[in-house]
């Protein structure tokens, strides 16, 4: 079995693919349409489903990364050597069980996702067989940000990254040698996975984000598009 550095056995199905093994286009999942008994998703349920969709996409990308290079087995020292300023949850952000603060946490989640966007752009030319997944992760993250911004009351507290700074960071990352680019890819995916999991844990504490609809396919991940907003 393939096993990545985080210890996850990736022998499970990538649920965001339909039966023909292509990414499900927005709003075109026949299985979704043919379920009139299902309640329409609340905004919180859509956010939950969107995050799980992205996490499944990250799993696919990590699988390719780990099969292609030895980065997933790299020592902790090598991981510690990176100087990437990747967003990370901390106690002060109010997203953990202790000291939970809905407003502070939501601001952190949105700010963090906005900061990740430049790194997701960097990933776009880093995959061969999973090019579609990389694009889907990037696009569905943009939609997730829009969903969350609709939920946030305190939009003024959200700082948007400077485009010029992002452009120079992207240039700098793309100019690295092959080994550093592989390491950067691995670290971005690992950190983004952790950030999304932390976000999902927090969002499931927030009010109406309690249950997900019964789904005969289990956790079938459907890409949510801007038309659904």
């Amino acid at each position: 079995d393939y096993k990545d550095h985080d210890g996850d056995y990736k022998d499970h199905d990538i649920d965001y693919k339909d039966d023909d093994d292509k990414l499900v286009p927005p709003g075109e999942d026949s299985k979704d349409v043919a379920a009139p008994h299902r309640q329409p998703l609340t905004s919180s349920e859509r956010i939950d489903k969107q995050i799980r969709y992205i996490l499944d996409g990250i799993s696919a990308l990590r699988k390719e990364t780990c099969n292609k290079s030895n980065m997933c087995e790299s020592s902790k020292e090598a991981l510690a050597e990176n100087n990437l300023n990747l967003p990370k949850m901390a106690e002060k952000d109010g997203c953990f069980q202790s000291g939970f603060n809905e407003e502070t946490c939501l601001v952190k989640i949105i700010t963090g996702l906005l900061e990740f966007e430049v790194y997701l752009e960097y990933l776009q030319n880093r995959f061969e067989s999973s090019e579609e997944q990389a694009r889907a992760v990037q696009m569905s993250t943009k939609v997730l940000i829009q969903f969350l911004q609709k939920k946030a009351k305190n939009l003024d507290a959200i700082t948007t990254p400077d485009p010029t700074t992002n452009a120079s960071l992207l240039t700098k990352l793309q100019a690295q040698n092959q080994w550093l680019q592989d390491m950067t890819t691995h670290l971005i995916l690992r950190s983004f996975k952790e950030f999304l999991q932390s976000s999902l844990r927090a969002l499931r504490q927030m009010g109406d984000l309690i249950s997900v609809p019964v789904d005969s396919r289990g956790s079938e991940q459907k890409l949510i598009s801007e038309e659904d907003l």
Epitope: G7, R52, K76, F195, R204
Partner: antibody, heavy 119, light 110 residues
Amino acid sequence: QSVEESGGRLVTPGTPLTLTCTVSGIDLSSYDMSWVRQAPGKGLEWIGYIYTDSSTWYANWAKGRFTISKTSSTTVDLKMTSLTTEDTATYFCAKGSTDYAFDTRLDLWGPGTLVTVSS
Amino acid sequence: NIVMTQTPSPVSGAVGGTVTINCQASQSISNELSWYQQKPGQPPRLLIYRASTLTSGVSSRFKGSGAGTQFTLTISGVECADAATYYCQQGYNSNDVDNVFGGGTKVVVV
């Protein structure tokens, strides 16, 4: 890869106790860990998780009395206070792998350490 | 507060037969459910995760199904070695929860 608990012993009610989970072949910065206990002849009872983001999540009944912490790159501690006879159980430490948020599948368990609380 | 309820317990099955164990969540947990097997004096062993994905090295005689609130573990071609207690574990939410595990179902092989 292996997981092993230690520190279990006979204590009197009210005595604090710290259990240690020592891992081998596992980088704790990359894995979620959990503590679970089992009273004699009873079912599994979840105590809490410590995730890779360093956040800790506890069962309602464990909040305030139990504390999970990573104490080194190979050890995770469970600190217990105000112990009562109801806390008599085998305490398990388990390594997790998480796909989404809380869905930590516990894929590697230690043999357990017995804590007996008696006067 | 998500509560996991397992039925029946105990359940008996004949060698070569089929045993079905049910696990019900008090609210929808999507497919975020794992199944464990525990034999006396041993720690639990992960059998199935994400409701239906078999863990590496586990016999295909074990099958998990379900989504939402209703889940089932089916053991086909029951063997003596399957005598154990089986637990389901929800992974949808761990905030305001007393226990992520179900109460357990003891399987007796006759």
